[in-house]
């Protein structure tokens, strides 16, 4: 009887495949007159279409690379695998979908890089005192979680330009605390102090050398610092095969993109590294603060987990920002930073207790739906994250990829990766819109009224000015 | 296409001057139209960036523009035991410009000021200042409502209340139909932000060169607040005027505060006594809701409507990913004393980091359909992020949600095409309102002229057989 394939009045194999994933096309010349060429496969076989003349591409998912998941992160870290498989090929015919799955494991003893980015405006004076032995304490605590820790240090205040900076009397430029009859450092935007190192005592030594500065207004320029600490990977020393924690500590609000105009700065942040040989952010006074969107993009690109370690008075603000910057955690910092050690350990635990998939470069014509199998083998539909995990747990996700119509570009690829992980699954997609029989097309065919058309897939495709089944 | 995208007129300013940062149409007393252009990084007489203002007479072929002359030298005056000082290097003259009647107001929001007394000082801070010019008569005046002679120690003792030292007056500016200059000063009251208002006529009459600190008796300033929602809110980042209380004898002020309430952003409508009539809150933190504001009647009901730009708004896309595209909110003014409610229409940008909504300009009735139209800029949108201006037509429901025309930047990437926009004035005298677009990164301004609209009417005659 009639069905979706036969009622659409299609006149070519390509059109037929686009009607529905259930439709097949018969290119057999011997197909009885009146039998539809576009029909369900079983109907075409019933109509005695030769099986080899039936065009019925089937969507498929093929694993191309599948290294097994690692148990431990120690040893040769470049061989550590946390996502499996690593590469698959999808073939999708128009409007069809295909399922594939991905497994993720939070491996034990994975290397960790922690970069401590500290607000050194005047109110952080007591905090600087509190963290002067943080390096060794952090190493002791983190040793329970990783045998391969590196820590680094950077500091920020704000853009050293009026009105954020005190510019009079002249003495205030070198000592912004001049009017308080005390001494503090000249204002700076962001300075990188200690490249990530496993010599944890160096952290203590460098922190002890630091001194606070002072700026005029309440918000600080920490987002400039986050951006630079994120994109200056060589300066900071972020390792490819490590968890990256960027610990941002402050007791104040932050400046955001478009605030810079109050200092006459309108050039948008370019998201590039501008930390020179002097380890200072050189574009501080020429480039605006970065937007949340740009920060998110760069943090994600560099697989950095941002931790907002902020005091009670601004915790709601940063909580709100964290909801707009996926993969960010927020912890409440005590007024003198004395609890920062526990805060980092807790935040790291929170990060490692969650696996959330992100998709990059998804073609517009594709849509994905996720089902998660987290703990107890329970399948949770519509979820692409798992919470409450322990280090060493493995989770899996079943993903359905559905294509809308037939994209122009026949081959595309996209990436699925857990947020904050280096590992990813690359999905190469081929959109199977064409029929194999098109390759045997006969241009100017005698079957089409002495060359008035191309004979293709069992039918005539007429040239300009000609109509009819034989272009007659 | 109402705006001709081919027959453009270009005006260029000095390299690196940021010519096009701000602009406005200027009509002289004979009705001749010119374009005032701000170039806040123009080099002054001592080769310091003082900024500058250019007056471009209308010529279809465009070209260079003469600059308006203002006193760009630092000034010092001794009054009793005090020394008053102005500092004009990097003052940003031309960061905002506005024309009214035959007067041009050009502001330098980063002009610094200090007062010295013995070993004490007020502190060198950006109070901001506006220069007024009547080009035909050569008259000049200055208005700097945030200058004062209070010393730093006094502010400390008073917990920094009523502290106008960082005002940046003239960061935004507008003149009411009645000739009152309204300045936005987002750094006023220790970065809460303030508004200053004074009649242009009184500014001229009270001005004496070299006095540096004087009083415009008819001026009024908004108030300080101890409400933390206003702290660092940059109230006055943008400003517009309109009619929002049903009383045609009064003018209301529209003020953008893009970082109000911990960066949520807000726009407030106030009466001329600075009493709040309405507050519109931002939708998303850090989206910079209130970066731009515009007032025009888009739905033809005779009441002013309000448009607000949030150029950093992030839209939730596939896979719940946020994409920073920018958004414009249309608030239609309801009948009667009702508050402006939820936005009637959301226009959302399409290009990542395009900053759609950075500038909004009323265009007048571009297509002669009885409804006013608007232009919205995405200075980093369009092909290769070169900038784009989109035209949206008015209709009885408000605005059409799809642009009727998209103007791609004729300048290279980084020119910030659309950073400043002005419309609703007919520059070429063809009866249709034109649009001027600033591209400070290219140091250029483009003039888009509206073309006559062809109205076709079809008649079908059916003959009896």
């Amino acid at each position: 009887g009639p069905n979706i394939c036969t009622t659409r009045g299609v006149s070519s194999c390509q059109q037929c495949l686009a009607v529905s994933p259930m439709c097949a096309w018969c290119s057999d010349e011997a197909l009885p007159l009146g039998s539809p060429r576009c029909d369900l496969k079983e109907n075409l076989l019933k109509d005695n279409c030769a099986p080899e003349s039936i065009e019925f591409p089937v969507s498929e998912a093929r694993v191309l690379e599948d290294r097994p998941l690692s148990d431990k992160g120690s040893g040769d870290s470049s061989q550590v695998t946390q996502v499996s498989p690593q590469r698959i090929a999808l073939r999708l015919r128009p409007d069809d979908s295909k399922n594939f799955s991905i497994q993720v494991r939070q491996v034990e003893d994975y290397p960790v890089d922690i970069y401590y980015l500290m607000d050194l405006s005047y109110s952080m004076k007591d905090d600087l005192w509190s963290i002067q032995n943080l390096g060794t304490k952090l190493a002791t605590q983190m040793r329970k979680l990783t045998s391969n820790l590196r820590i680094g240090f950077g500091a920020f205040v704000d853009k050293p330009v009026s009105p954020y900076m005190y510019i009079s009397p002249p003495e205030a430029l070198e000592n912004p605390c001049y009017d308080m009859k005390t001494t503090c450092l000249p204002m700076f935007g962001y300075k990188h102090v200690l490249t990530l190192t496993d010599q944890v005592t160096r952290f203590n030594e460098e922190v002890k050398k630091q001194s606070v500065s002072r700026n005029r207004d309440a918000p600080e320029g920490g987002f400039d610092a986050i951006m630079q600490a994120t994109v200056c990977d060589e300066k900071i020393g972020w390792r490819n095969d490590a968890s990256h924690l960027l610990v941002f500590t402050t007791d104040a609000k932050t400046h955001i993109a478009l605030d810079g105009r109050l200092a006459g700065i309108v050039q948008p942040n370019d998201g590039q590294c501008h930390v020179g040989s002097d380890n200072h952010y050189s574009a501080s006074t020429t480039m605006d603060y970065p937007s949340l969107g740009l920060m998110t993009e760069k943090l994600s690109q560099k697989n950095i987990n941002l931790i907002f370690a902020v005091t009670e008075n601004v915790v709601n603000l940063y909580q709100n920002y964290s909801e707009l910057i996926p993969g960010t955690t927020v912890g409440v910092l005590s007024m003198d930073s004395s609890n920062v050690l526990q805060l980092i350990v807790d935040a790291y635990g929170k990060i490692r207790s969650k696996v959330e998939l992100e998709v990059r470069d998804l073609p517009e014509e594709l849509s994905l739906s996720f089902n998660a199998t987290c703990l107890n083998n329970e399948v949770i539909p519509g979820l692409k994250s798992c919470m409450g995990l322990k280090i060493g747990d493995t989770v899996s996700f079943s993903i359905e990829a559905k294509v809308r119509g037939c994209p122009q570009e026949k081959e595309k690829s996209f990436t699925i990766k857990p947020v904050g992980f280096k590992d990813s699954l690359i999905v190469q997609v081929t959109f199977d819109c064409d029929c194999a029989c098109q390759a045997q097309a006969e241009p100017n065919s005698h079957r089409c009224n002495n060359g008035n058309g191309t004979f293709e897939c069992g039918v005539c495709r007429c040239g300009p000015g000609w109509l009819g089944s034989q272009c007659e | 296409l109402n705006l001709d995208p081919v027959q453009l007129t270009f005006y260029a300013g000095p390299n690196g001057s940021q010519f096009g940062f701000s602009l406005d149409f200027h009509k002289d007393s004979h009705g001749r139209v010119a374009i005032v252009v701000g170039a806040p990084r123009t080099l002054g007489p001592s080769q310091e960036e003082t900024g500058g203002v250019f007056l471009c007479p209308w010529r279809a072929e465009g070209g260079q523009c003469p600059s308006l002359l203002f006193d760009l030298r630092d000034e010092t005056r001794n009054v009793g035991s005090q020394t008053l000082q102005t500092f004009k290097a990097r003052q940003g003259l031309g960061a905002s410009v506005v024309s009214w009647s035959d007067v041009i107001v050009a502001c330098a929001p980063w002009q610094h000021w200090n007062v010295l007394e013995k070993t004490e000082e007020a502190e060198k801070t950006p109070v901001g200042s506006c220069f007024l010019a009547q080009p035909e008569s050569g008259r000049r005046a200055e208005y700097s409502p945030c200058r004062g002679n209070t010393l730093s120690r006094i502010y400390v003792e008073n917990d920094f209340s009523w502290d106008k030292r960082y005002c940046e007056a003239g960061f935004s500016s507008v003149v009411t139909q009645a000739g009152e200059l309204v300045l936005g000063a987002p750094g006023g009251y220790y970065f809460l932000g303030l508004l200053a208002q004074a009649p242009v006529a009184d500014i001229f009459s009270s001005y004496r060169p070299g006095i540096l600190l004087w009083h415009v008796s008819s001026q009024s300033l908004s108030f300080d607040s101890s409400n933390p929602e206003y702290f660092d809110g940059y109230w006055g980042y943008s400003v517009a005027v309109g009619e929002f209380d049903g009383d045609l004898n009064t003018t209301e002020y529209v003020v953008g505060a893009p970082t109000w309430s911990w960066t949520l952003g807000a726009v407030e409508i106030l009466d001329s006594y600075y009493q709040r009539l309405h507050r519109l809150r931002g939708e998303q933190m850090a989206s910079y809701f209130g970066h731009s504001v515009a007032v025009t009647d888009v739905n033809g009901d005779g009441r002013h409507d309000l448009l607000v730009g949030a150029p950093l708004y992030m839209e939730s896309r596939a896979d719940r990913k946020l994409a920073e595209v920018g958004r414009v909110y249309l608030f239609l003014q309801p009948r009667g004393p009702h508050a402006l409610g939820a936005p009637s229409l959301l226009l959302t940008g399409t290009q990542l980091y395009g900053r759609f909504g950075s500038a909004i300009a009323p265009l007048g009735d571009l297509d002669r359909d009885g409804y006013n139209d608007i232009a919205v800029a995405a200075p980093y949108g369009g092909p290769s992020g070169r900038g784009q201006v989109l035209v949206f037509l008015g209709q009885s429901e408000g605005l059409r949600s799809r642009p009727s025309q998209v103007l791609d930047s004729p300048f290279p990437t980084g020119s910030a095409f659309g950073f400043s926009l002005r419309g609703a004035v007919d520059i070429d005298d063809n009866g249709y309102p034109d649009l001027i677009v600033g591209a400070y990164g290219a140091n250029q301004v483009a003039v888009y002229r509206a073309q006559p609209v062809v109205k076709a009417s079809v008649q079908l005659l059916v003959q009896d057989s």
Epitope: K125, L128, W129, Q132, P169, E171, E174, N175, Y178, K181, T182, T183, L185, V207, K208, K209, Q210, S211 | K118, T119, E120, R153
Partner: antibody, heavy 121, light 107 residues
Framework: QVTLKASGPGIVQPSQTLSLTCSFS??????????VGWIRQPSGKGLEWLAH???????RYNPALKSRLTISKDTSNNQIFLKIASVDTADTATYYC?????????????WGQGTTLTVSS | DVQITQSPSYLAASPGETITINCRAS??????LAWYQEKPGTTYKLLIY???TLQSGIPSRFSGSGSGTDFTLTISSLEPEDFAMYYC?????????FGGGTKLEIK
């Protein structure tokens, strides 16, 4: 050349208020960045900073003694003064005045001759 | 308050020798430490400020080093007039505090 000299009563009875004077020359407290302060040293013990007065009349005190100290200046006569209320035997010490002239930071660059004070009934 | 611990409290050396005196702060004071010399019959004299900056008029045999919490005053090839009391003082925050002093005597 810069000189400072501290002077005081020599002996004072417990619970009384002690007044000390520092006379200086070679500089003026009208100069931005200039300050003069008091330091004391009980016999055989270390130095203890007490108070400081600055060019703009800003005053700083050691919190441990703040409630008992008052510092003031007479700029025209190049003098500063320190009053210590309710003295007791623990205040027996040599009292010095010293100058601070801002040069990137604040420190004592010139010291005066001390004045010895004994608290005794 | 920042506590300053100075060591040793007593030091005996001979002219021509090089000696070091140490000061340790209870918390980081960046570079802001000054050194003073006290000799009987004269006023206190500033030698070094900001950790390592030599006050004008002071001989170059005096030098200061250190930052954070640990600082050192070094006197190379001692002269007879160098035998005196030495004090360090932090000058970064109020209340300004001093070390307990080091008595340098001739051996």
């Amino acid at each position: 050349q810069v000189t400072l000299k501290a002077s005081g009563p020599g002996i004072v009875q417990p619970s009384q208020t002690l007044s000390l004077t520092c006379s200086f020359s070679g500089f003026s407290l009208n100069t931005s960045g200039m300050g003069v302060g008091w330091i004391r040293q009980p016999s055989g013990k270390g130095l203890e900073w007490l108070a400081h007065i600055w060019w703009d009349d800003d005053k700083r005190y050691n919190p441990a003694l703040k409630s008992r100290l008052t510092i003031s200046k007479d700029t025209s006569n190049n003098q500063i003064f320190l009053k210590i209320a309710s003295v007791d035997t623990a205040d027996t010490a040599t009292y010095y005045c010293a100058r601070s002239h801002y040069y990137g930071t604040f420190y004592f660059d010139y010291w005066g001759q001390g004045t010895t004070l004994t608290v005794s009934s | 308050d920042v506590q300053i611990t100075q060591s040793p409290s007593y030091l005996a050396a001979s002219p021509g020798e090089t000696i070091t005196i140490n000061c340790r702060a209870s918390k980081s004071i960046s570079k802001y430490l000054a050194w003073y010399q006290e000799k009987p019959g004269t006023t206190y004299k500033l030698l070094i400020y900001s950790g390592s900056t030599l006050q004008s008029g002071i001989p170059s045999r005096f030098s200061g080093s250190g930052s954070g919490t640990d600082f050192t005053l070094t006197i190379s090839s001692l002269e007879p007039e160098d035998f005196a009391m030495y004090y360090c003082q932090q000058h970064i925050e109020y209340p300004w505090t001093f070390g307990g002093g080091t008595k340098l005597e001739i051996k």
